[in-house]
Amino acid sequence: FERTRSLQDPCSNCPAGTFCDNNRNQICSPCPPNSFSSAGGQRTCDICRQCKGVFRTRKECSSTSNAECDCTPGFHCLGAGCSMCEQDCKQGQELTKKGCKDCCFGTFNDQKRGICRPWTNCSLDGKSVLVNGTKERDVVCGPSPADLSPGASSVTPPAPAREPGHSPQ
């Protein structure tokens, strides 16, 4: 089959890094400077991606593979193949149209990217808050109040956790 195909289509023999040159009676020609073909049988070479501005070069272009970009410090990649760079924010913030804004009370963001997410509601799982949440960190849920009642376990229970706004009984 391969032999039949190559007899029918001489371009199928052109390896990566070359293109099938119609101007030269369909012989394989190496890709011109700053272009590439990553697969065989190509009729053109693709122009290399240039990592400019907020993009920086992670991998140089070659005749057989495109350049790869990432983002300069203070920015992070978005999209397939790092098609966009988005500004970083601090932990405890999210990026809005007006720039980086602190997370609202009851929400947190532990990364330099993404949006602020609500704290975990411990009570939905019948648990209590062991460590309060902050703008940068989610709450830490502890054992349920029932687990902490005397006689619930033969193991000595830990001291009850204080929930925010509660004074010790």
């Epitope: 190496p30 890709c31 011109p32 400077p33 700053n34 272009c61 070659s62 005749s63």
Partner: nanobody, 111 residues
């Protein structure tokens, strides 16, 4: 324009070796891609070995492991070292850069 002239062809037995040379003159500073092609009687010209614009050597499947492309920029010369030659390597070998072609040098492998 760039002028190219090949040399080093000849008659050799199967399993033998030859070293082809391609001397370049003219505006060689614009050269980034240089290639060796060959054309056997009644067949289409085929790419054998080349230096890509990123300065990496590449080879057609038929040349891998047997042929080596190299160059000496001080002498403005491209080379093709051909080892373990086979009957099917018989062809006229051409040096190429862009639109410039040498006149070719005949390589005949025969017992």
């Amino acid at each position: 324009a760039v002028q190219l002239v090949e040399s080093g062809g000849g008659l050799v037995q199967p399993g033998g070796s030859l070293r082809l040379s391609c001397a370049a003159s003219g505006n060689i500073f614009s050269i980034r891609v240089m290639s060796w092609y060959r054309q056997a009687p009644g067949k289409q010209r085929e790419l054998v070995a080349w230096f890509a614009w990123d300065n990496i050597a590449h080879y057609a499947d038929s040349a891998k492991g047997r042929f080596t492309i190299s160059r000496d920029n001080t002498k403005k010369t491209l080379y093709l070292q051909m080892n373990s030659l086979k009957l099917e390597d018989t062809a006229v070998y051409y040096c190429n850069s862009g639109d410039s072609w040498g006149p070719g040098t005949q390589v005949t492998v025969s017992s």
